[in-house]
Structure formats: structure tokens, C-alpha cells
């Protein structure tokens, strides 16, 4: 409505004697600024005077003067928006209606605010959620419709008269909408808080009690139970009786059903507060509890661990680890259900008691083959001794033992024989699955662990075998000791170190690289003729006639071997020189005559010199001296000299006769 002044403030304000009131207020005048403001207490409109009557608590005029008695009431507003008021202290008789008379240049307005001042501080109000359940966080609210800047207060929470540990959050509101002080407490109630008194206490700044509000907590919770057992330690022997009783110490709302559980599983037909177990067996050992339900849910008691004691049951042995490798460690564990736990153990290996082993575990640090077998145990507790179970088998694995390579052939073995070897061993676990042989060869393995060497070589010295399961064990190598005829027989010149010259002393050696057996004989031959039976063949003074092809033979009991033919070469100066003439020693003049210097030399003649009857050397140096045409003057005695690297040789004189031709005779 545009004809009204617009005000905003709380409808009613609350306070108590001696406190104060802070009145938040805003307005909007119809026109212009505020020119006059009067605060009335219980104003009444006088129709006659057309003015308001009542106690004037505050008055402001155009000149801004305020009577001194009005200091209790303060106008904290302004001329156009704010109309906030403060009364400090406030008195009981300030209760009623406050009238704010506002005047502008042309308009007037009376705004009414209710003030409720009580004789004593009024109590705050506790607000609870509609339902409280155990362990679920709730917020408790304490609300007081009061707040004033000049009068500080505090709200404190108490549980059964004791300050609560949880931190509360206090908030205040002094707005045109609302005036209050509020404390909020977050709290997780437990079942034990059910029925307890919660108090919100109003205190002044010094902590002095002013007022309070109380509520009784109604905490919904599952039934809270106590379990009692006879006997109290819950330790019995098989055949004894046990009684368990379930007592409800608290339930909100009331409980509806009862049941019993063993190891978390419900026991059938057990729906009373007493559980009777007669003549218990060991299977009845376990954790027992009772469960009682209400609308909130089921509640469980603490667990009672019922121990039904019994002598050890037949034991079993666990082996870590089988099969075991020789030299490794092995642990045996004796497992036997018993209550109380066994205190003593007796161990057996292949039925024989293992002295001194009385613990649950047996440790063998280095397993050896004879530790294999069946291990069993017997457990013992205060109630008796168990039975020996079936036991566990320890398999001890190891490489083949005492491996040997055995030659099956009659001895001695000869080169070219077929040799059979076998690979033997003493024991093995697991079984031998394959064999290896050294050195490797293109040999036959006719059956497992047997090696056949066809046409055995002279140089097959040693052979070793390995028998293999998961591991290979090698035997010491065995010597085949193959016998063979002498090998690599050859002729070797010992003396002289350089070439052989006629007249030299010469020694030839018959060498061979090896022979088995070692005992040998030698034979020398030249052109099929036996020359000697020593390893050496000696010439005191060699002659060219000794040159030729020589062989030596070496033989042993297995056979004989010949060397390659070896050529003996004797070097000598030219010898047996002679001059031969062609076509003859008588030649007709004008024809051709060829003189040849023939010789025997090693190496062959490299240089010839021709001489005439005057021992005059002729300027010819080849083997043949060709005279063409021949002249009568050429008649005479000729000789030649041959030279090689060893020396020189000369021929005897040979006479050439050149006779006249018929023509020449005819001319004469």
C-alpha cells in the first residue's frame, strides 16, 4: 500500500528486569526525511486532541535536544532508514507496547512494537530431534529469544549436571527478522545415555546462573546383554555339562525375541534365556553368544569361548618340502587337534623312535639319502596321548652316485675294433633317464647307458660318461689304451745338414710319431733290397751310385707301416766327359760337323768350355760345337770342360779329320 510507511522489526521483544533490549528496526517514510521522533510507552490515541497520550520514553526535536532522563533509552536510528532503539537497563514496567511516533514534513506515523519484560530471566528452550538412536549423531539445540549488545549471556550444556565435553556452537541473531541466542551441540548418544537429563543453562557473562531448561533423553537402542557361564572359565572336558544364561541389562524399546549363536551361526530351538549343554563333545567348542532383538535391531552379548578339552587326535605330519634335495634342509610339523595344545611329541622315522625330539617341529639341516622314509608322530597333552597317524613320506633326491665307465671289450683294444662301453652307477633318485659321453662323437648308443664305437681310432684315448637324473654325475675318464701300428713313418736325413756331395758321410733316420705298443723294429730297403734293421742307415762315403729311392718300415705287434719313398740325391762334379762327333770323326770339307760334350754330373753341367789341340779355348760355351761349313783347317784334336756347382771335369782329346772334297781334289 503506497499510502503507508514501511517498517521492519521483530514483532515482540523479550527481556527481563535489569537486562537490556536492543530493537533492530528499519523504515521508509512516505516523503522526505524524519523531522520528529517520539517513543511512547503504551500510547493511546486521543480523538479530542488528535494526538497520542502515554509515557514518553524518548523524544527528539528539530533542535536535537533530548531531556537528560531519557539517557536510558537511545534512538540509534537516522532520518531516513534506521529506527533501531536500545533500552538499558530494561525494567519490568517497560513491558507493554512501544510506540514509535514518526513525523516528516507532511506525514505522520505510529509504529507499535511489543516488549515483554519478565521479573526473572526466562528459561531457554531445548529442541530435540523426533527420535534419538544410539551411536547416531544428533544435534541438540538450545534457543533463547533474547540478545542484547549491552548484556552478554552464555548457554552451557550439562549432562546429569556435569558439563558436556563436546564443543557447542553458539550463534546470536539481532536482525529486523529475529532476535535470539542459540547453542547447538553435536552429540553421539550411547545406550547408556537413555533416561539421562540434559540441561541447557543460561548464565551471565560471569557464569552466574540465570535460568535453565531440562529434557530427559530417550535413546532408542538394541538390547544390552550380559552372558554368564557355569563353569565360569568355560573350560570343560568331554562329557561335562555347561549352562549359559543371558541377562538383559537394558533395552529400548522392549525386546521381542531371544536366540543363541555358536561361531556366528544360530542354534536351532534355543529361544530361552538359558542354554543348557549336556555331555558336551569337542565339536561343541567354540564362541557362544546370545542375541536379543527389539524394534531397533538385534543386540549381542560378548562371546564366551567354550573350550571342550580332549586328548590329542591321531596326528598327521606335514613336510616342508618333499621331495627334498640331498644337502637341503627339511622341516617336519606334527599336526594333531588337541585341547589343551600338546605339550610333548614323540617322533618316529620308519617306525623307530627319534630320540630327543619332543617338539612340534623337527628340523633336519642337511638331508642325506638315508633320511628318506616315513615320518610319523604322537602328540601328548594333560588328558592323554594321541594315536600315531599314517605319517608322511620323505623322498630324498640326489644325483647318481659312484658313476663308472666300464669297457666291455677284451683287452687290448686294437685300432679299428668295435668298442662297447657301459655307464654304471650305484644308486640314483630319481631314476637315471639319460647318459652323456665325453668326448662327443658320431657313436652309436644301442641301449641306455651303452656306447658302441665302431672302428675305434688310434687316438681315442679316454672316454667318460655321466649318468643323469635331474642332475648329471660324471665318472672319471677311462683310458681305452687303443693299440695300433706305428704311425707317420718317414725318412729323415740327419747328416749332412746341407746337400749330399759325393764322398760325404750320410745318415738317414727312420722316424715315426707314435706306436702302441712302443716296442718296434726297423727295415731299410732300396729298390726292394733290404739294407738294414736299425733306425738309422749310414754311409761312410757316399757315391753317386748310392743315389736312389729309399724306404723304411717300422713294425710292432699290431702291424707294419712303410714310409713314403725318399729320394737320395748325390751331388758330384762333371765326370766321364767325352767329345762325340756327328756325323762322325771324318768329315768332308764344306759339310757340317757337330761336336757334343757328353758328361755325367749332378747337378747338370751349367757351363761348357771347348779347347783345340793347342789347348786354346774356343769362343763357344754350349754343349754342342757346330762347325759349318767345316774346313780342312778344322782338323785336329778337340776336348771339352764341363762346370757345375760342385766342380769341373775335362774330356780326353777326340780327333776330327776333315778331308778334301772331290771338287777340291779335282781342282788340284
Amino acid at each position: 500500500d503506497s499510502s503507508k510507511w514501511v517498517f521492519e522489526h521483530p514483532e515482540t521483544l523479550y527481556a527481563w528486569e535489569g537486562a537490556c533490549v536492543w530493537i533492530p528496526c528499519t523504515y521508509r517514510a512516505l516523503d522526505g526525511d524524519l523531522e520528529s521522533f517520539i517513543l511512547f510507552h503504551n500510547p493511546e490515541y486521543n480523538k479530542n486532541t488528535s494526538k497520542f497520550d502515554g509515557t514518553r520514553l524518548y523524544e527528539s526535536t528539530k533542535d536535537g535536544k533530548v531531556p537528560s532522563e531519557q539517557k536510558r533509552v537511545q534512538f540509534l536510528g537516522d532520518k531516513n532508514k534506521n529506527c533501531t532503539l536500545s533500552i538499558h537497563p530494561v525494567h519490568l514496567n517497560d513491558s507493554g507496547q512501544l510506540g514509535l511516533r514518526m513525523e516528516s514534513k507532511t506525514e505522520k506515523w505510529m509504529e507499535r512494537i511489543h516488549l515483554n519484560v519478565s521479573e526473572r530471566p526466562f528459561p531457554p528452550h531445548i529442541q530435540l530431534p523426533p527420535e534419538i538412536q544410539e551411536s547416531q549423531e544428533v544435534t541438540l539445540t538450545c534457543l533463547l529469544n533474547f540478545s542484547c549488545y549491552g548484556y552478554p549471556i552464555q548457554l552451557q550444556w550439562l549432562l546429569e549436571g556435569v558439563p558436556m565435553r563436546q564443543a557447542a556452537v553458539t550463534s546470536t541473531s539481532l536482525t529486523i527478522k529475529s532476535v535470539f541466542t542459540r547453542s547447538e551441540l553435536k552429540f553421539s548418544p550411547q545406550w547408556s545415555h537413555h533416561g539421562k537429563i540434559v540441561t541447557c543453562q543460561l548464565q551471565d557473562a560471569d557464569g552466574k546462573f540465570l535460568s535453565n531448561d531440562t529434557v530427559q533423553l530417550n535413546v532408542k537402542h538394541t538390547p544390552k546383554l550380559e552372558i554368564k557361564v557355569t563353569p565360569s572359565d568355560a573350560i570343560v572336558r568331554e562329557g561335562d555339562s555347561v549352562t549359559m544364561t543371558c541377562e538383559v541389562s537394558s533395552s529400548n524399546p522392549e525386546y521381542t525375541t531371544v536366540s543363541w549363536l555358536k561361531d556366528g551361526t544360530s542354534l536351532k530351538k534355543q529361544n530361552t534365556f538359558t542354554l543348557n549343554l549336556r555331555e558336551v563333545t569337542k565339536d561343541q567348542s567354540g564362541k557362544y553368544c546370545c542375541q536379543v532383538s527389539n524394534d531397533v535391531g538385534p543386540g549381542r552379548s560378548e562371546e564366551v569361548f567354550l573350550q571342550v578339552q580332549y586328548a590329542p587326535e591321531p596326528s598327521t605330519v606335514q613336510i616342508l618340502h618333499s621331495p627334498a634335495v640331498e644337502g637341503s634342509q627339511v622341516e617336519f610339523l606334527c599336526m594333531s587337534l588337541a585341547n589343551p595344545l600338546p605339550t610333548n611329541y614323540t617322533w618316529y622315522h620308519n617306525g623307530k623312535e627319534m630320540q630327543g625330539r619332543t617338539e612340534e617341529k623337527v628340523h633336519i639341516p642337511k638331508i642325506l639319502p638315508w633320511h628318506a622314509g616315513t615320518y610319523s608322530c604322537v602328540a601328548e597333552n594333560i588328558l592323554g596321548t594321541g594315536q600315531r597317524g599314517p605319517g608322511a613320506e620323505l623322498d630324498v633326491q640326489y644325483p647318481p652316485k659312484k658313476v663308472t665307465t666300464v669297457i666291455q671289450n677284451p683287452m687290448p683294444i686294437r685300432e679299428g675294433d668295435t668298442v662297447t662301453l657301459s655307464c654304471n652307477y650305484n644308486s640314483s633318485n630319481p631314476s637315471v633317464t639319460r647318459y652323456e659321453w665325453k668326448p662327443h662323437g658320431a657313436w652309436e648308443e644301442p641301449s641306455l647307458g651303452v656306447l658302441k664305437i665302431q672302428n675305434v681310432g688310434w687316438d681315442n684315448t679316454t672316454i667318460a660318461c655321466a649318468a643323469c637324473n635331474s642332475w648329471c654325475s660324471w665318472a672319471s675318464p677311462v683310458a681305452l689304451n687303443v693299440q695300433y701300428a706305428p704311425r707317420d713313418v718317414r725318412v729323415r736325413k740327419i747328416k749332412p745338414l746341407s746337400e749330399i756331395h759325393s764322398g760325404n758321410s750320410v745318415s738317414l733316420q727312420c722316424d715315426f710319431s707314435s706306436s702302441h705298443p712302443k716296442e718296434v723294429q726297423f727295415f731299410w730297403e732300396k729298390n726292394g733290397r733290404l739294407l738294414g734293421k736299425e733306425s738309422q742307415l749310414n754311409f761312410d762315403s757316399i757315391s753317386p751310385e748310392d743315389a736312389g729311392s729309399y724306404s723304411c718300415w717300422v713294425n710292432n705287434s699290431i702291424g707294419q707301416t712303410a714310409s713314403k719313398a725318399w729320394t737320395l740325391e748325390v751331388l758330384y762334379a762333371p765326370r766321364r766327359l767325352r767329345v762325340s762327333m756327328s756325323p762322325g770323326d771324318q768329315v768332308m770339307e764344306g759339310k757340317s760337323a757337330t761336336l757334343t760334350c757328353e758328361s755325367d754330373a749332378n747337378p747338370p753341367v751349367s757351363h761348357y768350355t771347348w779347347f783345340d789341340w793347342n789347348n786354346q779355348s774356343l769362343p763357344y760355351h754350349s754343349q754342342k760345337l757346330r762347325l759349318e761349313p767345316v774346313k780342312v783347317q778344322h782338323s785336329g784334336a778337340y776336348w771339352c770342360q764341363g762346370t757345375n756347382s760342385v766342380g769341373k771335369g775335362r774330356s780326353p782329346l777326340s780327333t776330327l779329320t776333315v778331308y778334301y772334297s772331290p771338287e777340291t781334289i779335282g781342282r788340284r
Epitope: I364, P365, W370
Partner: antibody
């Protein structure tokens, strides 16, 4: 009857070495380790070490490493203890003892040798 | 090393007496304790193993007890042939160690 026969008493000079023997009989020699003990003039016993005749495995007390050497001769069922760089502290009775069939190093001893007295004196 | 202490070096006794020889281990050795008897010029002889088990052929008057750190060898009805040195030994930990011995003498 299980027996461990030890070699006779030894009188040796300081700095020298001594090798004593222990011959086993009455049981399978290679199935039990042989332990050695030192006893000073009727006083407490000290464990020296052990050897297994099956595989010549040895183990020594840290205190006797470098002093004692154990060896075995399977062909004669004999174990040897050699003590080197002898001093007067080595004068004692040395016992060979049969160890545990299951090779436990944590054991007690039921079969003792006859003992070898070693006297180290210049 | 675990020290085995036999606090009494000598003990005087008479024939027919009940004698208790004690041995204290430097740390818990469970029941891994053996007792030996040694007569002058002889090798030690095993009497008890596993703290309380009598070895084959050992007379019933010898009993062993204890576990952890405290052990006792008891001879009920002491005989003159029982005059000897007695040693305890632990075999719970390596190296194996022996007590210093207790010598039984006639009063």
C-alpha cells in the same frame, strides 16, 4: 657295540702341530657326523666343530677356526683332528663324539671317544 | 654364546642323600639341556637329555627337571659310584656350550 677309539697321548713343542685320530666301529660310519670337544684339566668342555664322513662337510666353532682342521679317511672309518701353531693353551684332553643321525647341530652326545691328551711344553 | 652357570663347584654329600645340582642358562633354552657324568680319567657319560628324559641304562635315581633358564639334576638315594663331576649342556643355540661342572664329594 658302538665305539670311538682315539689315538694315544701326545707331547709336543710350542709352535708345532699335532694330528690325532678317532676310529669308529660298531655302526655305519658314513651316517653320523663326528663332533670334537676340548676339555681343560677336568674343567668345562668346549665344542670345537664337526665333520660328516659321508661328504666331508665341516663346521667349526668360530673360536677354533684357523686352529683346528678336521679330515676323514673313509677307508679306515677314521676321523682326524689336526691342531696347528700349538701353545700351552692347547694343552687339554680332546674327545671325539658321535653326532646326530639327522645332522642337527643342536644336539646332545651319547657316544664319546676315549680321549687324547695333548701336552704342549718346550 | 649362551653361558651355562653351575654355581656350586663342589658339593659334599653322603650315601643315601638326595642331591640337587643346579644349572642356570644365560637365556631361554626351552628344554634343550643334557646332563653328563664324568669320573676321573674317563670320558663323559650322558645321563639326561631334553631336560628330563633319562638316557638308556641310566638308573632311576637320576632325574632332570626345569625349562627356560633353570635346570636341576637330582640324585635320590646317592650311591658311592655317583661320586663324579656333573656337567650340564645346552643345545638350543649355536655354538653348543657346557656348564663349568659340579664335583660331588663325600662329607
Amino acid at each position: 657295540q658302538v665305539q670311538l677309539q682315539q689315538s694315544g697321548a701326545e707331547q709336543v713343542k710350542p709352535g708345532a702341530s699335532v694330528k690325532m685320530s678317532c676310529k669308529a666301529s660298531g655302526y655305519t660310519f658314513t651316517t653320523y657326523p663326528i663332533e670334537w670337544m676340548k676339555q681343560n684339566h677336568g674343567e668345562s668342555l668346549d665344542w670345537i666343530g664337526n665333520i660328516h664322513p659321508y661328504n666331508d662337510d665341516t663346521e667349526y666353532n668360530e673360536k677354533f677356526k684357523g686352529k683346528a682342521t678336521l679330515t676323514v679317511e673313509k677307508s679306515s672309518n677314521t676321523v682326524f683332528l689336526e691342531l696347528s701353531r700349538l701353545t700351552s693353551d692347547d694343552s687339554a684332553v680332546y674327545y671325539c663324539v658321535r653326532g646326530d643321525y639327522y645332522n642337527s647341530r643342536y644336539w646332545y652326545f651319547d657316544v664319546w671317544g676315549t680321549g687324547t691328551t695333548v701336552t704342549v711344553s718346550s | 654364546d649362551i653361558v651355562m652357570t653351575q654355581s656350586q663347584k663342589f658339593m659334599s654329600t653322603t650315601v643315601g642323600d638326595r642331591v640337587s645340582i643346579t644349572c642356570k642358562a644365560g637365556q631361554n633354552v626351552r628344554t634343550a639341556v643334557a646332563w653328563y657324568q664324568q669320573k676321573p680319567g674317563q670320558s663323559p657319560k650322558l645321563l639326561i637329555y631334553s631336560a628330563s628324559t633319562r638316557y638308556i641304562g641310566v638308573p632311576e635315581r637320576f632325574t632332570g627337571s626345569g625349562s627356560g633358564t633353570d635346570f636341576t639334576l637330582t640324585i635320590t638315594n646317592m650311591q658311592s659310584e655317583d661320586l663324579a663331576d656333573y656337567f650340564c649342556q645346552q643345545y638350543s643355540s649355536f655354538p653348543l656350550t657346557f656348564g663349568t661342572g659340579t664335583k660331588l664329594e663325600l662329607k
